[in-house]
Interface confidence: low
């Protein structure tokens, strides 16, 4: 049977096949893919911008930052306000004070400890 390079197309992940000769072809890959048949998802994590211990997670032509609990935002640069998330973070009338990367309790009436429970 007659071999037609682009029928069926050997290009995957949405790549477009172009016949370059009687028995040769070229795949034009969609952004985010590479390889002779567009089989590889390009790693988008080198030189990533994830900060404050955020972990880069590769996607298709993009990446996401998986942030530790104290940080949020696209690049984990926005501080999570734990005082809003945990209204009862401080016990016994203590006042919650949000800080970069965490929070602290200002205790009253002789109470002490991280959450004013001692």
């Amino acid at each position: 049977s007659l071999y037609v390079p682009c029928a069926p197309s050997p290009c995957v992940n949405g790549g477009t096949c172009r016949q370059t000769g009687d028995f040769t072809f070229e795949c034009n890959c969609l952004p985010g893919f590479e390889g002779s048949t567009c089989e590889r998802n390009i790693d988008d994590c080198p030189n990533h911008r994830c900060q404050n211990g955020g972990v880069c997670v590769d996607g298709v032509n993009t990446y996401n930052c998986r942030c530790p609990p104290q940080w949020t935002g696209q690049f984990c640069t926005e501080d999570v306000d734990e005082c809003l998330l945990q209204p009862n973070a401080c016990q016994n009338g203590g006042t919650c004070a949000n800080r970069n990367g965490g929070y602290g309790c200002v205790c009253v009436n002789g109470w002490s400890g991280d959450d004013c429970s001692e």
Epitope: P31, E34, I42, D44, N47, R49, T62
Partner: antibody
Framework: SLEESGGGLVQPGASLTLTCTAS?????????MCWVRQAPGKGLEWIAC???????TYYASWAKGRFTISKTSSTTVTLQMTSLTAADTATYFC??????????????WGPGTLVTVSS | AYDMTQTPASVEVAVGGTVTIKCQAS??????LAWYQQKPGQPPKLLIY???TLASGVPSRFKGSGSGTEFTLTISGVQCDDAATYYC????????????FGGGTKVEIK
């Protein structure tokens, strides 16, 4: 657009600070800003980059210690240079990358500022 | 680390011809490579990024290919306006690197 300023004629051993001013965008969008230089008749030489969302810096191995890149506002980046020698004579370009996944692909360049080190 | 070597240093090509410029990385950089065009008295202009993606407004006669350590910039149907110096640049790593850029290739038109 980008525009460099602060270049000129300086004596060997002197210090100089170059400023790159951005207009039409701000660094809060997550761009990296870099400095690249070019000696007369020579090729492009990378100096340093700064990740504007965090302040993290990257330097060419030869530039560490004598060059300092800083973000001084949401639209300005500086390059401080110390102990200048004739070998530092070059046009200094400021460049901006494409942001996020286009890290260090320099889509935008300033026209450059000439620094001449001579006695 | 990640030194970029460009060849040839200069090349002469006739109008309508094809020119091929090669760039070799000392270590694998995946597809993290850009090509720039620079004319005298001007800043560089981004032509191709991610090894093969054409930058906005760049004519289709410019083509980038390769991955790993071997990369090629091909200019087909060369025009007088293509006379310039071309640079490759790795964007894979900025740690312990002397220069992101290759040494450049000057393209002259016959």
């Amino acid at each position: 657009s980008l525009e460099e300023s602060g270049g000129g004629l300086v004596q060997p051993g002197a210090s100089l600070t170059l400023t790159c001013t951005a207009s039409g965008f701000s660094f809060s969008s997550g761009y990296d800003m870099c400095w690249v230089r070019q000696a007369p008749g020579k090729g492009l030489e990378w100096i340093a980059c700064i990740v504007t969302v965090s302040g993290n810096t990257y330097y060419a191995s030869w530039a560490k210690g004598r060059f300092t890149i800083s973000k001084t506002s949401s639209t300005t980046v500086t390059l401080q240079m110390t102990s200048l020698t004739a070998a530092d004579t070059a046009t200094y370009f400021c460049a901006r990358d494409g942001g996020f996944t286009d890290t260090w692909y320099f889509h935008l360049w300033g026209p450059g500022t000439l620094v001449t080190v001579s006695s | 680390a990640y030194d970029m070597t460009q060849t040839p240093a200069s090349v002469e090509v006739a109008v309508g011809g094809t020119v091929t410029i090669k760039c070799q990385a000392s270590e694998s950089i995946g597809s993290y490579l850009a090509w720039y065009q620079q004319k005298p008295g001007q800043p560089p202009k981004l032509l191709i990024y991610r090894a093969s993606t054409l930058a906005s407004g760049v004519p289709s006669r410019f083509k980038g290919s390769g991955s790993g350590t071997e990369f090629t910039l091909t200019i087909s149907g060369v025009q007088c306006d293509d006379a310039a110096t071309y640079y490759c640049q790795q964007t894979y790593s900025g740690a312990g690197v002397d220069n992101l850029f290759g040494g450049g290739t000057k393209v002259e038109i016959k």
